[in-house]
């Protein structure tokens, strides 16, 4: 059973390592994949002394942990590299850090990337 699923056909693309990887630095990435597989968008970034450094954004392969996530939100507490994934076109355009620990109340830190 799948409720209210949104198709992902394209995602915001960004690669901080674009010269070495020989890719574009930024743009829109069409998401390809098998017909029976779902597609997602993702974002990875670092927080260097309070400054947000985007590592990559783009399409992400079918992953059950991305299902039913309409917003790109990292919920892990203090990760080394922040990661989020989501479903829906360009849903990785904005991403946020919203740590949800077992006991303490979460605080939201939304981030709008400026590549």
């Amino acid at each position: 059973a799948i409720l209210g699923r949104s198709e992902t056909q394209e995602c915001l693309f960004f690669n901080a390592n674009w010269e070495k990887d020989r890719t574009n630095q930024t743009g829109v990435e069409p998401c390809y994949g098998d017909k029976d597989k779902r597609r997602h968008c993702f974002a990875t970034w670092k927080n260097i002394s309070g400054s947000i450094e985007i590592v990559k954004q783009g399409c992400w392969l079918d992953d059950i942990n991305c299902y039913d996530r309409t917003d790109c939100v990292e919920k892990k507490d203090s990760p080394e590299v922040y990661f989020c994934c989501c479903e829906g076109n360009m849903c990785n355009e904005k991403f946020s850090y919203f740590p949800q620990m077992e006991v303490t109340q979460p605080t939201s830190n939304p981030v709008t990337p400026k590549p």
């Epitope: 059973a1 409720l3 597989k37 079918d62 992953d63 059950i64 942990n65 039913d68 990661f83 949800q100």
Partner: antibody, heavy 118, light 111 residues
């Protein structure tokens, strides 16, 4: 420390029902997809069911479709497997497993034994 | 129906190297199936060894490595030890919320 504790197993007659529970602790339950995997005596592992973070998407192996229902209560940090119309071939140890990005099972419970016999 | 195949059994000498493989009947295994590997000793819950083709799980010794070999996923154990004697299972994530386990490989460490 991540802990997954299954309960609810036992002896049941063919055609009967059981509800398995998996109590999760040591991580933020509502952030991760979850799954059930079983192992019949002397046999290999078999994936049974999976559920997304919200519970909005549920998935089953063909042999249990229409008989088993997976659900989760994110406020209680608990995963469930409602098993109806049980058959002898459902006899197995049932494990709950936490699923992480790239869809792998990163933590496992110790399992609960379900025996279907008359 | 997708069937994931593994060698039913394998033997290795202590200190030797063994490669277990994982294929399926519908084509080639690629990284898009997120192959993962699990070790299980009798009466115990499975232990996660390798995920996402080649990433070692926390606490897993670097004697264990994962890869794609030809059209199969592979688990290589180098410098095999007596306590590596276990059952090893590969899992492929088929997408759309579905996983398929291989039948498992029973690894015997000789001697």
């Amino acid at each position: 420390e991540v802990q997954l504790l299954e309960s609810g197993g036992g002896l049941v007659q063919p055609g009967g029902s059981l509800r398995l529970s998996c109590a999760a602790s040591g991580f933020t339950f509502r952030n991760d997809a979850m799954s059930w995997v079983r192992q019949a005596p002397g046999k290999g592992l078999e994936w049974v069911s999976g559920i997304s973070v919200t519970g909005g998407s549920t998935f089953y192996t063909d042999s249990v479709k229409g008989r088993f229902t997976v659900s989760r209560d994110n406020s209680r940090n608990t995963l469930y497997l409602q098993m109806n119309s049980l058959r002898a071939e459902d006899t197995a140890v049932y494990y709950c497993a936490k699923v992480y990005y790239t869809s792998f099972f990163d933590y496992w419970g110790q399992g609960t034994l379900v025996t279907v016999s008359s | 129906q997708t069937v994931v195949t593994q060698e039913p059994s394998f033997s290795v000498s202590p200190g030797g190297t063994v490669t277990l493989t994982c294929g399926f009947n519908s084509g080639s295994v690629s990284t898009s199936y997120y192959p993962s590997w699990y070790q299980q000793t009798p009466g115990q819950a499975p232990r996660t060894l390798i995920y996402n083709t080649n990433t070692r799980s926390s606490g897993v010794p670097d004697r264990f490595s994962g890869s794609i070999l030809g059209n199969k996923a592979a688990l290589t154990i180098t410098g095999a030890q007596a306590d590596d004697e276990s059952d090893y299972y590969c899992v492929l994530y088929m997408g759309s919320g579905i996983w398929v386990f291989g039948g498992g490989t029973k690894l015997t460490v000789l001697g």
